[in-house]
């Protein structure tokens, strides 16, 4: 997370850390708890060549990475069938946990938005994660969860910005309908935040608007952060994840 600050302990109870096996269980991406037994993340975190179940664990909301780990095994990894690269889209995946999480005030699910929600500019939105704090600058110990408020940008404006200084023709969309843009040169998500949630407060409820997907660098001029637009994939999500009663 570029800019922003350490998150208060009481906030973002749906935030999770994805861990890959190595000399230690290392954080590599974020995710969000959308059901007691399901985590939403980015497809590029776990695919297109899907990792072994044996190589992956989920850590629920923790203030500082690695300090009080209780790693959870995953029973299924589901990558969106249309995913190839983040820039092309469909950068979304689901992880099914072996056991449902015991929800509490400290750890619970985030609400998915209604299909009609567009998340217009001006809406109060935040992105969270344990990723880099600037381009090629790692989050330093004790690895606190960070948060930053990011401005939403309309897709057509974001697309125009991404065409500035790019070889892509103006008639070729860079920012597609299944994407959402947020951030500026002082506030952005970065490497290691991928898969984590962009949430917006709508009528007093936090809704997950996006999944951290891609961008050219972090907090670069004319290059806002790009997120997978959750509303675009609600039907796909609910094909696997039970709706709340």
């Amino acid at each position: 997370i570029v800019g922003g600050q350490e998150a208060p302990r009481s906030k973002w109870p749906w935030q999770v850390s994805l861990r890959v096996h190595g000399p230690y269980w290392m954080h590599f991406c974020g995710g969000s708890l959308i059901h007691p037994q399901w985590v939403l993340t980015a497809a590029h975190c776990v695919g297109p060549d899907v990792k072994d179940l044996a190589a992956l664990r989920v850590q629920l909301r923790e203030q500082h990475l690695y300090y009080q780990d209780q790693l959870l095994p995953v029973s299924r990894i589901i990558v969106h069938p249309q995913f190839y690269t983040a820039q092309i889209g469909a950068d979304i995946a689901l992880l099914e946990l072996e056991e449902p999480v015991n929800v509490s005030s400290h750890v619970h699910t985030v609400t998915l938005p209604p299909a009609s929600e567009t998340f217009p500019p001006g809406m109060p939105c935040w992105v969270t994660g344990w990723g880099d704090v600037d381009n090629d600058e790692r989050l330093p110990p004790p690895f606190p969860l960070k948060q930053v408020k990011v401005p939403i940008m309309e897709n057509h404006i974001c697309d125009a910005k991404y065409h500035l200084g790019a070889y892509t023709g103006d008639d070729v969309r860079i920012v597609r309908d299944d994407m959402l843009c947020a951030g500026n040169t002082r506030r952005d998500s970065c490497q290691g935040d991928s898969g984590g949630p962009l949430v917006c407060k709508v009528n007093g409820t936090w809704l997950q608007a996006g999944v951290v997907s891609w961008g050219e660098g972090c907090a670069q001029p004319n290059r806002p952060g790009i997120y997978t637009r959750v509303t675009y994939y609600l039907d796909w999500i609910h094909h696997y994840v039970p709706k709340k009663p």
Epitope: V50, K51, D52, L53, A54, P73, S75, E98, E99
Partner: antibody, heavy 119, light 106 residues
């Protein structure tokens, strides 16, 4: 001592049913995913089914799906395999095994129980 | 489903020989697991996460590989190594074992 002891095997007619049990001791049973593996006479190992620590997740080999049911009773430290519609090709030694928590290999095995399906 | 193919199915070797068993997965996996079984006995964990030796396994055993091709190697075969070895993946369910490789005395 960490131990798994299977029981319940025996001779059963084709189409019949049998329930295998596996008694666990020497470890906190409720912390571990458990697995059944079988081995037909003179043949190799075949994975049968998996059950997660709290029974929320179960998976079966395709040939066993719909006929076999894996379950557990954490209060009794016991794993079960209910086998219905048994066929001659289900004749095998059935092993109960524990999945290592950190590294997911099958680190503790029972001695096995022989199931013979024959008329 | 991922299929596992071991080769050879059996091999004859002498004490002191270097022995290599291969396991091929039908699609890419991250890790391979190996078990040793002797006649009339339960299998024992032998190698996990491709190259880590299970407790009590002698250092003459090693594991390697990535993607679809993995190997178990015995640098200098000893009398107690004559057994059947099975590979297994933990990529996704259903889990599958290879058909086994029987190491016999020449």
């Amino acid at each position: 001592e960490v131990q798994l002891v299977e029981s319940g095997g025996g001779l059963v007619q084709p189409g019949g049913s049998l329930r295998l049990s596996c008694a666990a001791s020497g470890f906190t049973f409720s912390d571990y995913g458990m697995v059944w593996v079988r081995q037909a006479p003179g043949k190799g190992l075949e994975w049968v089914a998996f059950i997660s620590s709290g029974s929320s997740t179960v998976y079966y080999a395709d040939t066993m799906k719909g006929r076999f049911t894996i379950s557990r009773d954490n209060s009794k430290n016991t794993l079960y395999l209910q086998m219905n519609s048994l066929r001659a090709e289900d004749t095998a030694v059935y092993y109960c095994t524990r999945r290592n928590y950190d590294d997911v290999y099958f680190d503790v095995w029972g001695q096995g129980t022989l199931v013979t399906v024959s008329s | 489903d991922i299929q596992m193919t071991q080769s050879p199915s059996s091999l004859s070797a002498s004490v002191g020989d270097r022995v290599t068993i291969t396991c091929s997965a039908s699609s890419s996996v991250t890790y391979m697991y190996w078990y040793q079984q002797k006649p009339g006995k339960s299998p024992k964990p032998w190698i996990y996460r491709t190259s880590d030796l299970a407790s009590g396994v002698p250092s003459r055993f090693s594991g390697s590989g990535s993607g679809t091709d993995f190997t178990l190697t015995i640098s200098s075969l000893q009398p107690e190594d004559f057994a059947t070895y099975y590979c297994q993946h933990y990529h996704s369910y259903p889990l599958t074992f290879g058909q086994g490789t029987k190491v016999e005395i020449k």
